[in-house]
């Protein structure tokens, strides 16, 4: 069968080989398409409800005034010339529709290095067959599931027209120290060959490099956090970051109801002050950062205290 590709909505003429150029003609067209079950026969004398879809012209050709998705299929003509010689024509018709230019919607203006970011969603509307969407970084194809690249795709079909809408959401994890203004674009590749890809306008988000946070240090005095009953413990939260963040205190994982301060003093230690303490530094540009936890305990005379603070957090104290 001869392969024919026709654009949806356009007319199509299929020639019936060997048919006399004008009536009387002995010919018959048979079609097996989305509009038929098995074969439908159309003859030159026809004319009727099928004319809107396909009709035999005076020269024996089959005319489809506006090809649709349901017209995909096989078209056969059997013709006999004046001498009684039979000729057969066989066509395989496939249809296509080029969508509008794809667009990137919900695009990010800024990405953060080192963490996954949504770059944007590429949308293509009105294609047939569905085709595919692909992403490019600085003109080179991006491969999903490689180097922090992930793509979420969705295909929908219009209930009336049968045309496809494709959506592709791109997530990337930019490398630290990489290109500060990467160029992303998306392209639609048609499902039928011999049609060039359609590319979106590019987008150029900025890549923001978060300053690596230095660790929050918690210093306990006396060292090890073991103190005799009635003694005093001083906890100091050291944060190298500038400007100085707000410091809050936790005991046994629960925030202490105290105003922010980098120093927590526990005077006249009693059993109620025992527990695990930590501090939380809150930066305006980053999230909260918690220190290691230290354990504060009471040692009875004659006991040896622990040599270092062990993991844990909280009891009310005085702030310096």
């Amino acid at each position: 069968a001869q392969n024919i590709t026709a654009r949806i909505g356009e007319p199509l003429v299929l020639k019936c080989k060997g048919a006399p150029k004008k009536p009387p003609q002995r010919l018959e067209w048979k079609l097996n398409t989305g509009r038929t079950e098995a074969w439908k026969v159309l003859s030159p004398q026809g004319g009727g409800p099928w004319d809107s879809v396909a009709r035999v012209l005076p020269n024996g050709s089959l005319f489809l005034p506006a090809v649709g998705i349901q017209d995909e299929g096989i078209f056969r003509c059997q013709a006999m010339n004046r001498n009684g010689k039979e000729t057969k024509s066989n066509y395989r018709v496939r249809v296509y529709q080029i969508p509008g230019k794809p667009e990137i919607v919900d695009s990010a203006s800024e990405l953060t290095a080192g963490v996954p970011n949504k770059v944007g969603t590429c949308v293509s509307e009105g294609s047939y067959p569905a085709g595919t969407l692909s992403w490019h970084l600085d003109g080179k194809p991006l491969v999903p599931n490689e180097k922090g690249v992930s793509v979420k795709e969705q295909t929908r079909r219009h209930p009336e027209t049968g045309l496809f809408t494709l959506q592709s959401e791109l997530m990337v994890t930019p490398a630290r120290g990489g290109d500060p203004r990467p160029t992303f674009s998306c392209s639609f590749s048609p499902g039928l060959p011999r049609h060039r890809a359609l590319r979106t306008a590019p987008i150029q988000p900025r890549v923001w490099e978060p300053v690596p946070l230095e660790e929050v240090q918690l210093v306990v005095e006396p060292e090890g956090g073991a103190v005799a009953p009635g003694g005093t413990v001083t906890l100091t939260c050291e944060v190298p970051a500038q400007p100085s963040p707000q410091i809050h205190w936790m005991k046994d994982g629960v925030p202490l109801p105290l105003p922010p301060s980098p120093v927590l003093i526990l005077p006249e230690i009693g059993p109620q002050d025992q527990g695990t303490y930590s501090c939380v530094a809150t930066h305006s540009s980053h999230g909260p950062q918690e220190s290691r936890a230290v354990s504060i305990s009471i040692i009875e005379p004659g006991e040896e205290g622990p040599t270092a603070g062990s993991v844990g957090g909280s009891g009310l104290g005085t702030l310096a």
């Epitope: 509009r35 038929t36 079950e37 439908k40 004319g47 009727g48 409800p49 099928w50 004319d51 809107s52 879809v53």
Partner: antibody, heavy 119, light 107 residues
């Protein structure tokens, strides 16, 4: 709202003529074939004529061929049926309906107009 | 010309009954059969298109099926508003041919 409204029916003598009209609204008229169907009193439905969306091609059953002419004016969203040489057996309610090809067939109907052929 | 033989020409049924109406085409018409409902003094209303598809706004108790050249309209549970005359229509070829109609009456 998609609507078809027929007019032009009435009493006519045998051998006489009558022109029915159908005003369409609520849809893109020139996208559809259009059809006339009739129903004699107490009888079933009978196809009378169809016309393609451009108006270039018309179709009739043998019972009305050469006597009836279907036409359309896409600019006016109107369908017409010119009936000549009327006979007693043409007495019926005449309905205008949207469609007439394999894509859309009689999905919307008008309320009908009565044609009586009698002396 | 294609003949559409519709049966029965009339039937009596009660509310809640399952009702089946059949049309047989004299030759292959593919899927190109519609079903219509008509009430006295009113225009026909399309119920089923292309043999099996329910038209917009039509209750789901109506359904259409096809087996070769036999076409069936089924009302799964007859309602008071379903008492009417039903017609099939073949539109694969001209002349377009309607079945003779089936009048559904209250038993």
């Amino acid at each position: 709202e998609v609507q078809l409204v027929e007019s032009g029916g009435g009493l006519v003598q045998p051998g006489g003529s009558l022109r029915l009209s159908c005003a369409a609204s609520g849809f893109t008229f020139n996208n559809y074939w259009m059809t006339w169907v009739r129903q004699a009193p107490g009888k079933g439905l009978e196809w009378v004529a169809s016309i393609d969306n451009s108006g270039d091609n018309t179709y009739y059953p043998d019972s009305v061929k050469d006597r009836f002419t279907i036409s359309r004016d896409n600019a006016k969203n109107s369908l017409y049926l010119q009936m000549n040489s009327l006979r007693a057996e043409d007495t019926a309610v005449y309905y205008c309906a949207r469609g007439g090809d394999i894509r859309v067939m009689l999905d919307v109907w008008g309320q009908g107009t009565l044609v009586t052929v009698s002396s | 010309d294609i003949q559409m033989t519709q049966s029965p020409s009339s039937l009596s049924a009660s509310v809640g009954d399952r009702v089946t109406i059949t049309c047989r085409a004299s030759q292959d018409v593919g899927i190109y059969v519609n079903w219509f409902q008509q009430k006295p003094g009113k225009a026909p209303r399309r119920l089923i298109y292309r043999a099996t598809n329910l038209a917009d706004g039509v209750p789901s108790r109506f359904s259409g099926s096809r087996s070769g050249t036999d076409f069936t309209l089924t009302i799964s549970s007859l309602q008071p508003e379903d008492f009417a005359t039903y017609y099939c229509l073949e539109f694969d070829e001209h002349p377009l041919t309607f079945g003779g109609g089936t009048k559904v009456e209250i038993k």
